[in-house]
């Protein structure tokens, strides 16, 4: 028997492959076969294509035909047209490329033709009949990639065998698509096997590298072993990773099973599944998931605090009624006066002190201190009353610095020490009041907005910190956070902002400017139109005094009655924010065209400012980010905190702002 | 021009075997499959099978396998078929035919030439 | 298998007449039919192949129509020569030739 009609065979390039199957098979019966296989009957569109087929087929008898994928219904004839009425079975007409046996006839087209093409010579395409039963068929299958074909080795047996998705077994291939298996042969009688799979970095690539057929011993590159190779008694060597690795299913190479691990927070080689999940203090793990972590209500715990507590994820504050401030140690209170502002003030970094260095504080405040930048013809809202208590607000970080960001005055004064809120990045925590201490440097007026310091150091993917969401149980109704939760996308590139979607996450790719998507919100009228923005700067966060219902997942609006607006004039595209509010249509912001997004320089000079993530690394190699609220999918989630509009807040003239107090306060985050 | 020339008439005893063959000439012989054909009398047309000279390839009628086969000898470019235990209802005419490949840029399995036929009578 | 059945068997008809021979395939051919005329003592020669198409050398006074189970052949002016037996074959299911059963043409 001849080898052309004994077996298919393939031939593939980086990108397709075409197959021939000699099997006999009518049109209809080809274009089913190609399709359960996952490909299509072969469309060689252009010469390059064509040229491949032709090495496929090779110099076959005359007497041979094969279907590729062209058909034409009943008078349908356009025979002035390259493919002369005939379409692809891809459903277009588009070639750049044909090779009719004949030229076009003036026949009056009555019946359904198809397209065959002869085994021999020329390869030239045929019409004929669908319903024939010709001798085979040849199919396409189009793919990511492709893996080239493995190289000979010294102790190899043979050469490699390879098996494609489309079930083709051959040694005889230049590529192999995705998905193929290759199986080699040694001498000394183990084989392997490899994949050829997705590469992390991008492309495709066998599984595992080689030498695929190791010598006798270690001494060759190690035996093919990543970390370390033991010399067996009967020659053959076998691969052991270092403490904290466990072997990879090449059985060559390690991996950190931490580097995969479903972690909310900490990560931790070892155990049965290779690995342990922990929770920080403040957390403990979830009862249905133990992946996952859960705040710890410290407020539930009798006497926590001597008057008043609030909970919020990862920590809790106490506080004290009016007319009583808390003492040193954060539970007590005592009668206002018998304590000190400045005591008030240091509570933090005496009781609380996470050794940072106070230097480096004060240089982060200096970098701080003059970053503001005037925004002229801006109508900014200020809150109804100025506040008549102090604030300590402290963020907490496992990190050596703690970025900080400008907390707007309040829309309410309560009559409390209020609770601080933790801070990150992705969370723009602008629901509550604060008072500047005298150690650190006043707000502007009402006419310079600030710039929200937002350069943060480099993570891995694996290490990136979603959101930690602030709850406030004690509080009333009215005075809790609306959640709006915004997609992040997981890493941004260099010289990149964050990329920010209310949809779609990591859907921008390197070096393109990130768009916020048009959000509509049901009820309010309000619609958030953000240009694109250029790689050297950060998004902007608008924030618009309407009040709003807290159902509005999609949408970028964060409400509020008296937060500041960091934009800085630019000549960048118009950004256009509106809000109408049924209940206050006063509220409407219109911000000019020459308004655009911020620059947002860093409150940590030590840092590289190419990279715009989350500004916390966990101290545990293999810790990860608390994700709250938690949703399944690729990314961590930007989750905005904002808070509910007084009712009867109007629009003035904006007075002086604050910053939040600059001290460590929970070492729950360590 | 193309032309398939037949083995002259045989007369055969039942039980007995008979091989008939089929000289092509005026084109390449192993571009073209052979097929074989019976004509009873009174009987239409029936298909008993084929051979591809290029590879040997051969597919018979269900209804003759076993008893029928069919070969070639490409140096020759002779076709050969062979028919064993004859009984009297193989009495027929059996051409030899050409199917075609393809007419004016067209595929089609027809046969275009035929051998002039050859009478074969099984009889006691 | 698939059969096919030619109507009618026999045919009178005079020089210059419009002849028609039709075909019928017990399952759907698409357009895998050929006609062949056998005069007596010879062998079969291609008239019609793929239904429609008319085979090198063949007058023009044949035609053939039809696809899927219904198939005709046309004799548009009946000439002394074409007195013969015609077949129809089908081939779909190739290579299982089926013919049928034949049409006689004689001359009134």
């Known amino acids: 028997q001849d080898p052309w009609a004994a077996e298919p065979r393939a031939a593939c390039g980086p990108s397709s492959c075409y197959a021939l199957f000699p099997r006999r098979r009518t049109f209809l019966e080809a274009w089913r076969a190609c399709r359960e296989l996952g490909g299509d009957l072969a469309t060689p569109r252009t010469p390059e294509e064509a040229q491949r087929v032709d090495s496929l087929v090779g110099a076959g008898p005359a007497s041979r035909l094969l279907w590729i994928g062209l058909q034409r219904q009943a008078r349908q004839c356009q025979l002035q047209r390259p493919l002369r009425g005939f379409t692809w079975t891809t459903g277009d007409q588009d070639t750049a490329f044909t090779n009719w046996a004949q030229p076009a006839s003036g026949g009056p087209c009555p019946a359904q033709r198809c397209v065959a093409l002869e085994a021999s010579g020329e390869h030239r395409w045929l019409e004929g009949s669908c319903t024939l039963a010709v001798d085979g068929y040849l199919c396409q299958f189009g793919f990511e990639g492709a893996c080239p074909a493995l190289q000979d080795e010294a102790g190899q047996a043979g050469p490699a065998v390879y098996t494609t998705p489309f079930h083709l077994v051959s040694t005889e291939f230049e590529w192999l698509p995705f998905g193929s298996v290759a199986a080699v042969q040694c001498q000394a009688g183990r084989g392997a096997s490899l994949l050829c799979v997705k590469q992390p970095e991008g492309g495709v690539g066998w599984s595992r590298a080689g030498p695929l057929c190791l010598g006798t011993g270690c001494s060759p590159d190690n035996g093919g072993c990543e970390h370390e190779c033991v010399e067996e008694v009967d020659g053959h060597v076998s691969c052991r990773c270092t403490e904290g690795f466990r072997l990879a299913a090449d059985g060559r190479s390690c991996e950190d099973p931490c580097a995969q691990a479903p972690c909310e927070q900490q990560c931790e080689p070892g155990g049965p599944q290779g690995y342990s999940c922990h929770c920080r203090l403040g957390f403990r793990p979830a009862e249905d998931d133990p992946h996952r972590c859960v705040d710890t209500d410290e407020c539930q715990i009798a006497g926590v605090c001597q008057q008043m507590c609030v909970n919020y994820v990862g920590g809790f504050e106490c506080y004290c009624s009016e007319g009583h401030e808390l003492e040193a140690d954060g539970i007590s209170c005592s009668p206002a006066g018998a304590m000190g502002a400045q005591a008030s003030q240091d509570l933090g970094d005496e009781l609380l002190d996470d050794g940072e260095d106070e230097e480096d504080e004060d240089e982060a405040w200096k970098a701080f201190n003059g970053g503001w930048t005037e925004m002229p013809g801006i109508l900014w809202m200020e809150p109804t009353q100025p506040p008549d208590f102090a604030l300590a607000y402290r963020p907490s970080f496992p990190e050596d610095r703690e970025p900080q960001i400008p907390y707007p005055e309040p829309t309410w004064p309560p009559p409390l020490s209020a609770p601080r809120v933790p801070y990150h990045s992705s969370v723009l925590s602008v629901t509550r009041p604060v008072v500047v201490s005298a150690t650190h440097p006043t707000l502007p007026s009402a006419h310079q907005p600030p710039v929200i310091p937002a350069t943060h150091p480099a993570l891995s993917r694996d290490h990136q910190i979603p959101v930690i969401a602030a709850n406030y149980p004690d509080l009333p109704s009215a005075y809790q956070p609306g959640i709006l939760s915004v997609s992040h996308s997981a890493q941004p590139p260099a010289h990149q902002p964050p990329m920010i979607s209310t949809k779609y996450p990591e859907l921008f790719p390197a070096h393109q400017s990130p768009m916020f998507p048009d959000t509509r919100v049901a009820g309010t009228q309000t619609t958030t139109h953000l240009p694109g923005i250029p790689p050297n700067h950060a998004p902007l966060v608008t924030t618009l005094g309407a009040q709003l219902p807290p159902q509005a997942p999609d949408a970028l609006v964060l409400r509020t009655q008296a937060t500041q607006l960091p934009i800085i004039p630019t000549a960048q595209p118009s950004l256009t924010t509106t809000s109408r509010s049924p209940v206050s249509p006063a509220h409407q912001i219109s911000v000019p065209a020459a308004t655009q997004p911020a620059a947002l320089p860093t409150l940590l000079p030590s840092q590289s400012p190419t990279n715009q993530t989350s500004p916390i690394s966990p101290t545990h190699p293999h810790s990860k980010a608390p994700q709250i609220p938690r949703e399944d999918g690729p990314s961590p989630k930007l989750a905005l905190w904002l808070p509910s509009p007084a009712p009867t807040a109007a629009p003035t003239a904006l007075g002086e702002a604050g910053l939040a107090e600059h001290s460590q306060r929970d070492d729950r985050w360590l | 021009q193309v032309q398939l020339v037949q083995s002259g008439p045989e007369v055969k005893k039942p039980g007995a075997s008979v091989k008939l063959s089929c000289k092509a000439s005026?084109?390449?012989?192993?571009?073209?499959?052979i097929h074989w054909v019976k004509q009873a009398p009174g009987q239409r047309l029936e298909w008993m099978g084929y051979?591809?000279?290029?590879?040997?390839?051969?597919t018979y009628n269900q209804k003759f396998k076993g008893q029928v086969t069919i070969t070639v000898d490409t140096s020759a470019s002779t076709a050969y078929m062979e028919l064993n235990s004859l009984r009297s209802e193989d009495t027929a005419v059996y051409y030899c035919?050409?199917?075609?490949?393809?007419?004016?840029?067209?595929?089609?399995?027809?046969?275009?030439?035929w051998g002039q036929g050859t009478l074969v009578t099984v009889s006691s | 298998d698939i059969q096919l059945t030619q109507s009618p068997s026999f045919l009178s008809a005079s020089v210059g007449d419009r002849v028609t021979i039709t075909c019928r395939a017990s399952?759907?051919?698409?357009?895998?039919v050929a006609w062949y005329q056998q005069k007596p003592g010879k062998a079969p020669k291609l008239l019609i192949y793929?239904?429609?198409n008319r085979y090198t050398g063949v007058p023009s006074r044949f035609s053939g129509s039809g696809s899927g189970t219904e198939f005709t052949l046309t004799i548009s002016s009946m000439q002394p020569e074409d007195l013969a037996t015609y077949f129809c074959?089908?081939?779909?299911?190739?290579?299982?030739?089926?013919f049928g059963q034949g049409t006689k043409l004689e001359i009134k």
């Open positions: 074959q089908q081939y779909t299911n190739y290579p299982m030739y089926t």
């Open positions: 051979i591809n000279p290029y590879d040997d390839d051969t």
């Open positions: 399952q759907n051919v698409g357009t895998a």
């Open positions: 035919a050409r199917r075609g490949n393809s007419y004016d840029g067209y595929f089609d399995y027809s046969m275009d030439y």
């Open positions: 005026g084109y390449t012989f192993t571009d073209y499959v």
């Open positions: 793929s239904a429609s």
